[in-house]
């Protein structure tokens, strides 16, 4: 906030390889945006879309990658009358290497190879209990050996020292296709570690993202208090205890006999405390004899504790 | 001199368990994808499974997939194979195989050969 | 059933050249790297030629190897005695996650 009046921006000479989707969001009112300097090899579709107000646009690269990616360029910049400042010449593929992506027929922007990775097997989203081993996998293919390399973000944040382990099988058709893994190990988990991780695969023509898997950390349900056996005469009021932790907060369920339609129940004798640990029943009758069960579950699992109710008549 | 030694091996009864080990020297252990490759008597070789450098990639045959279990302990240079359920077709000749890495800038490029054989060990299973 | 297919026996008299086939599909020899070992009854196998045609240090050149397609070949000159062995291709089937698989083998003799 505070930039969306920004009339004018200069970026040139900053090692600009890549355009994002929403790399110049929050600058709706750009009128002269300047990337020159810049081996631009790519820029996502509709990049520039929201800068209605964009006049002048300035690009000097001759590393672009003239994949299917790019189509949507040279008809964008035509039809926003941006073409004059652009000078945009292929690199790659071969068969395209130093034409203007404005002389290239459209037909002839394909992805025949992939030499910016591809994703192929992607994170998933995990549950793991504190104090376990997780890991994160993550493949791409590419059809380029031009050096790779892997990186993993925690919450959008590159992960600087992050455990991981990288390796590659190749396949061999018609010319090599490399399959990438990058697997991340996250070792004795904490709270500390609950996030959304997403890995990030690059090499000379552009970095691909995963998409974002979160882990949730778990803790089983432990009691805090259990009930115990009581004995009480009928009429009064009986007394129960039960409260446990965990992660997620367990919810504290009671059964009778293993049941949950029983009569303290039905007959709204039954009384549990909200913010309490104790579960009452009042007017206590020959029938609410058994054996109580307190039930803790949350999402890691559910642990049980048993009291037995005896009921003596007055 | 760049070695494996498998062991582990016997005699068990079908649906029982049995645990091989596979311990490495004379290379960097770490650097290299592991295998299980078996033979049953009279029979070819059988691919089994296999484990990435670290560890975090396993692969399985189908015959064995939900039964086998392969794992490693890098401070201790060793590859294991748990083998639950046994049947008797999982009779055989039991070999780990170093699969040949190249390790370049923590990257490892897995190629198609196994180079390192151990000597293999018998697993027998029958009643 | 085997995935690739090799003849059970071949057989040459020593000094001769033999080939020995291995035949698959496009989702293995088609898609991926093959390689061969050579079991001499009794021993563990033994790496003979990977990626295709790279022969392992200490492999001798009467080995080499190529492939077309979805077939590939073994090439022995030159044959010795202790030549005489079982021979296996091997490849990945599909990707990496579904795993290797090996040829059902072909036993040389030398006569």
């Known amino acids: 906030s505070g930039l969306d009046s920004l009339s004018k921006l200069t970026l040139f000479g900053n090692k600009i390889k890549s355009v994002a989707k929403r790399a110049f969001s929050g600058l709706e009112g750009l009128e002269h945006l300047n990337l020159g300097g810049n081996a631009i090899r790519s820029v996502q579709f509709d990049a520039f879309v929201k800068m209605k107000n964009l006049k002048e646009l300035h690009i000097s690269s001759d590393s672009f990658l003239c994949d299917c990616q790019l189509k949507w360029l040279p008809p964008w910049l035509i039809g926003r009358m941006l073409q004059a400042f652009v000078t945009a010449t292929c690199a790659h593929p071969e068969s395209l290497k130093g034409q203007s992506i404005f002389s290239v027929p459209p037909e002839s922007f394909v992805c025949d190879d992939f030499l910016k990775p591809q994703i192929i097997t992607q994170p998933e989203t995990t549950m793991a209990m504190v104090g376990k081993d997780i890991r994160f996998t993550c493949s791409a293919a590419s059809s380029s050996s031009s050096p790779m390399t892997f990186a993993w973000k925690k919450d959008n944040e590159v992960l600087t020292n992050a455990d991981m382990e990288n390796f590659v099988h190749v396949h061999a058709q018609d010319g090599e296709v490399m399959e990438y893994t990058t697997i991340l190990h996250l070792r004795q988990v904490t709270f500390g570690h609950e996030g959304r991780y997403q890995c990030v695969i690059t090499n000379h023509f552009g970095s691909t993202y995963s998409h974002k898997a979160r882990l949730t950390v778990n803790v089983l349900p432990s009691f805090t208090k259990t009930p115990h056996d009581i004995t009480i005469r009928t009429t009064t009021m009986a007394r129960l205890e039960c409260a446990a932790t965990g992660h997620p907060n367990p919810q504290i369920a009671w059964q009778k006999d293993g049941g949950t339609d029983f009569p303290a129940a039905r007959e709204r004798r039954m009384h549990v405390m909200p913010d309490d640990d104790v579960f009452f029943i009042t007017d206590v009758k020959i029938d609410d004899a058994g054996v109580y069960s307190c039930t803790a579950q949350n999402s890691a699992g559910s642990i049980s504790a048993n009291a037995t109710l005896t009921v003596l008549e007055t | 001199e760049v070695q494996l030694l498998e062991s582990g091996g016997g005699l068990v009864q079908p649906g029982g368990s049995l645990r091989l080990s596979c311990a490495a020297s004379?290379?960097?252990?770490?650097?290299?994808?592991m295998s299980w490759v078996r033979q049953a008597p009279g029979k070819g070789l059988e691919w089994v499974s296999v484990?990435?450098?670290?560890?975090?990639?396993?692969y399985y045959a189908d015959s064995v997939k939900g039964r086998f279990t392969i794992s490693r302990d890098n401070s201790k240079n060793t590859l294991y194979l748990q083998m639950n359920s046994l049947r008797a077709e999982d009779t055989a000749v039991y070999y780990c195989?170093?699969?040949?890495?190249?390790?370049?800038?923590?990257?490892?490029?897995?190629?198609?050969?196994?180079?390192?054989w151990g000597q293999g060990t018998l697993v027998t299973v029958s009643s | 059933q085997l995935v690739l297919t090799q003849p059970p026996s071949v057989s040459a008299a020593p000094g001769q050249r033999v080939s020995i086939s291995c035949s698959g599909s496009?989702?293995?020899?088609?898609?991926?790297?093959v390689s061969w070992y050579q079991q001499v009854p009794g021993s563990a196998p033994k790496l003979l030629i990977y990626?295709?045609?790279k022969r392992p240090s200490g492999i001798p050149d009467r080995f080499s190897a190529s492939k077309s397609g979805t077939s590939a070949t073994l090439g022995i000159t030159g044959l010795q005695t202790g030549d005489e062995a079982d021979y296996y291709c091997?490849?990945?089937?599909?990707?990496?996650?579904?795993?290797?698989?090996f040829g059902g083998g072909t036993k040389l003799t030398v006569l």
């Open positions: 195989a170093r699969v040949i890495s190249n390790c370049h800038l923590g990257v490892c490029y897995y190629s198609n050969g196994m180079d390192v």
């Open positions: 004379g290379f960097t252990f770490s650097n290299y994808a």
């Open positions: 484990i990435s450098h670290g560890g975090g990639s396993t």
């Open positions: 496009s989702s293995n020899i088609g898609d991926n790297y």
């Open positions: 990626d295709n045609n």
């Open positions: 091997a490849t990945w089937d599909g990707s990496l996650s579904a795993g290797r698989v």
